[in-house]
Interface confidence: low
């Protein structure tokens, strides 16, 4: 199929980073300059993705692929290949339309993104608080109160929190 | 690593013609643009043309059409430039250069061309 | 042909110093100007790319703004290792065209 399909239609053999150019007889040109062709066989060339203003570049276009963008230092991408830029707040914060917010008592937000989420409750799981919550972090659950009855082994130490800038994306 | 290594300085006689060299190494020879570069002593940068060594594919400024020709060796992954009808004015240092889409990228180290009688 | 006019045509800074230079272009050009490095006895090196794009391992005290006709390279706080020349050129259709140069001298 691909062999008779090539002999059909000459642009099937134009590269990707080439497209296929009709108005000089098919011949497969290079895509001029800012774009690109990521596939064999195009009759276009795309143009290049801009990175500007908030957005920051990645990855620079090539003659067979798009730019990728990123954000700048203080924004977060959101949405499928970074279409937007988000603010970035505080850990211990979430951002609402009037800006960066503080966690409401009784919830927390560990990133720089996301919202505030209720601090886990213990006693569902028949535990007890080990470690209070902040803004920034989960409370701690430690055994229940009927474990620490004399003679019990000793708690282990919660794992250290991590280290801010540090939580994932 | 991308290199682009030039040929070395050419000493050419007024009316004669020149061909250097850009061997490329280092990324795909045949799906990038090769630019070449020309500046005289002293002064900026001058486009001279570009190639697409995957289909010898070239377009030229018009100011050197008819005085540069650009060809390229997928093969041996190098590209070539040929001066002909040369004068003093051709006196310079020439450049290949791998273009990303938006810029020359990278840069070979030159060729100095001395026309001289 | 584009016309990429750089100014000023020298300049002589001291360590820590500011430098701006400027490049204009004769006609919308959008992003597409790069700007490079140049020092004595070498081939020209790509700094900015798209405008405002740091190339890779270029350091941050050199910082490229504007677009359409106007564009500017800044050197936050200049070193004796800057001194060269500095060329702006468009990448926006062909013929690509430079500027002239702008040579930075280091008090």
């Known amino acids: 199929f691909e062999r008779t399909r090539s002999l059909q239609d000459p642009c099937s053999n134009c590269p990707a980073g080439t497209f296929c150019d009709n108005n000089r007889n098919q011949i497969c040109s290079p895509c001029p300059p800012n774009s690109f062709s990521s596939a064999g066989g195009q009759r276009t060339c795309d143009i290049c993705r801009q990175c500007k203003g908030v957005f920051r570049t990645r990855k620079e276009c090539s003659s067979t692929s798009n730019a990728e963008c990123d954000c700048t230092p203080g924004f977060h991408c959101l949405g499928a290949g970074c279409s937007m830029c988000e603010q970035d707040c505080k850990q211990g914060q979430e951002l609402t339309k009037k800006g960066c917010k503080d966690c409401c008592f009784g919830t927390f937000n560990d990133q720089k993104r996301g919202i505030c989420r209720p601090w886990t409750n213990c006693s569902l799981d028949g535990k007890s608080v080990l470690v209070n919550g902040t803004k920034e972090r989960d409370v701690v659950c430690g055994p229940s109160p009927a474990d620490l009855s004399p003679g019990a082994s000793s708690v282990t130490p919660p794992a250290p929190a991590r280290e801010p800038g540090h939580s994932p994306q | 690593e991308v290199q682009l290594q030039q040929s070395g300085t050419v000493l050419a006689r007024p009316g004669a013609s020149v061909k250097m060299s850009c061997k490329a190494s280092?990324?795909?020879?045949?799906?990038?643009?090769m630019h070449w570069v020309k500046q005289r002593p002293g002064q900026g940068l001058e486009w001279i043309g570009v190639i697409y060594p995957g289909n010898s594919d070239t377009s030229y400024n018009q100011k050197f059409k008819g005085k540069a020709k650009l060809t390229a060796v997928t093969s041996a992954s190098t590209a070539y430039m040929e001066l002909s009808s040369l004068t003093n004015e051709d006196s310079a240092v020439y450049y290949c250069?791998?273009?990303?889409?938006?810029?020359?990228?990278?840069w070979g180290q030159g060729t100095t061309l001395t026309v001289s009688s | 042909n584009i016309v990429m006019t750089q100014s000023p045509k020298s300049m002589s800074m001291s360590v820590g110093e500011r430098v701006t230079l400027s490049c204009k272009a004769s006609?919308?050009?959008?992003?597409?100007v790069s700007w490079y490095q140049q020092k004595p006895e070498q081939s020209p090196k790509l700094l900015i790319y798209?405008?405002?794009n740091r190339y890779t391992g270029v350091p941050d005290r050199f910082t490229g703004s504007g677009s359409a006709t106007d564009f500017t390279l800044t050197i936050s706080s200049v070193q004796p290792e800057d001194l060269a020349d500095y060329h702006c050129g468009h990448t926006y259709n062909y013929p690509f065209t430079f500027g002239s140069g702008t040579k930075l001298e280091i008090k």
């Open positions: 798209g405008a405002s």
């Open positions: 280092g990324y795909s020879f045949t799906s990038n643009w």
């Open positions: 250069t791998r273009g990303i889409t938006t810029a020359p990228e990278y």
């Open positions: 006609e919308n050009v959008g992003i597409y």
